[in-house]
């Protein structure tokens, strides 16, 4: 059930077990008789077919190409081919840092706010059955934790928790010992206190429209990362198939907050769309802010003072 390798560009560290799993795996099982081939190309070599005879380090299982381990000369392009399905990866194998327990280029950075929940779990689902033991290191010093199969840290973050955490899985394969390292760079930051989210622009907007035409109602807000923005307009689903919420757009502000924009698209405007409230709401744990749009027929706009129109 391990997910396939969908990323087209992959960087790995020399000396570790590694695998590529193609993304038509379920299909491959259905067509057992179909020819399935793995190829490599690098530099002067064009499309060399791979098989266990090409290298003692390579193994092929169903949907997976395994390296035991991957080495610098494995750098190159890899292809999986089956009937008219092809998948390609570009593999870059980098040197291991011999002076550290991890390689800087293979570090995942995470920012955690002080006093917030902080968790590190050492798991590797693909090699799970082969793993003998797993150790967790902080700044290359081994942490003494109870569980040596899946060491875990779960706590409220303190500034002292900052550092490089490396999960090292030890496993045996064909009588040889291998290890796989996954490192996190944890930075602990001050509590970034939340703002009260606010919708931008007037709270009530009359929009002049023509029947049969389309309109886009744009709702913008300044909010926190975990706040949400959504449209509310009539409860019954499917009552108007011409109304669509577009994907929300978010841009981070220099202060670490978010500017969000969510568009409601109304196509082929009909009478039923006029003089009803289309509400946009931004919500947080601290409260909500709502802004309303009312569609008004252009012919009727003379009845409403000009300053209340948004277009």
């Amino acid at each position: 059930a391990e997910s396939c390798t969908s990323r087209p560009h992959i960087t790995v560290v020399e000396g570790e077990p590694f695998y590529l799993k193609h993304c038509s795996c379920s299909l491959a099982h259905e067509i057992e008789t179909t020819t399935k081939s793995w190829y490599k190309s690098s530099g002067s070599q064009e499309h060399v077919e791979l098989n266990p005879r090409s290298s003692s380090r390579i193994a092929l299982h169903d949907c997976v190409l395994e390296f035991w381990p991957v080495e610098l000369n494995d750098t190159g392009s890899y292809f999986f081919q089956m009937k008219n399905y092809t998948q390609k990866w570009k593999l870059n194998v980098i040197r291991r840092n011999k002076h550290s327990c991890f390689t800087e280029r293979q570090v995942t950075s995470k920012i955690v706010e002080v006093k917030k929940f902080f968790q590190i779990t050492c798991e590797n689902s693909y090699y799970q059955t082969l793993v003998n033991s797993t150790s967790l290191y902080k700044n290359c010093k081994k942490l003494l934790l109870e569980n040596n199969k899946n060491p875990t840290i779960k706590k409220n973050a303190e500034f002292e928790d900052q550092g490089y955490y490396s999960c090292v899985h030890f496993l045996h394969h064909n009588g040889k010992l291998f290890n796989i390292t996954k490192t996190f760079n944890i930075t602990i930051v001050e509590d970034r206190s939340n703002i009260v989210p606010v919708l931008l622009g007037p709270k009530l907007n009359h929009v002049a429209v023509e029947l049969g035409k389309n309109v886009r109602l744009n709702c913008s807000a300044l909010l926190n990362e975990e706040d949400v923005i959504y449209w509310m307009f009539g409860e019954e689903n499917g009552s108007d198939p011409n109304i669509h919420e577009e994907k929300e757009m978010r841009i981070m502000t220099p202060e670490g907050k978010w500017h969000a924009s969510k568009v409601l698209r109304i196509e082929n405007i009909g009478e039923s769309n006029l003089n009803v409230l289309y509400n946009c709401t931004v919500a947080s744990t601290g409260g909500t802010d709502t802004k309303s749009f009312i569609l008004v027929r252009k012919a009727d706009m003379a009845d409403i003072p000009g300053h209340v129109f948004t277009r």
Epitope: E235, N237, T288
Partner: nanobody, 114 residues
Framework: EVQLVESGGGLVQPGGSLRLSCATS???????MGWFRQGPGKHRELVAR???????YYVDSVKGRFAISRDNAKNTVYLQMNSLKPEDTAVYYC?????????WGQGTQVTVSS
């Protein structure tokens, strides 16, 4: 403090189904409730909501595949997810809609992959 506990997620193949549950420590009788999701590298979005009277609303991407329901006696909201697609992969959360949010629960991870 109100608590929301989501459950029912898991790993499922494309085309498969899951039923998520959300148990809350407050009475939901008079509340609009919704299911939100946050995909990898994305922001949290409302995908389905249900009014106190049981009227429902879904975003286009899940219409016809997801069904939200509620059991006021158990203070629980459900999301039946059918014909799942890889793009439905996300952490799913429930919360109040049209009023201040309750503190977010841990969510339940849904992974759709072959």
């Amino acid at each position: 403090e109100v608590q929301l506990v989501e459950s029912g997620g898991g790993l499922v193949q494309p085309g498969g189904s899951l039923r998520l549950s959300c148990a809350t420590s407050e009475s939901i009788f008079s509340l609009n409730m919704g299911w939100f999701r946050q995909g990898p590298g994305k922001h949290r979005e409302l995908v389905a909501r249900i009014s106190p009277a049981g009227s429902t609303y879904y975003v286009d991407s899940v219409k016809g595949r997801f069904a939200i329901s509620r059991d006021n006696a158990k203070n629980t909201v459900y999301l039946q997810m059918n014909s799942l697609k890889p793009e439905d992969t996300a952490v799913y959360y429930c919360n109040r809609v049209n009023t201040a949010l309750a503190p977010w629960g841990q969510g339940t991870q849904v992974t759709v992959s072959s």
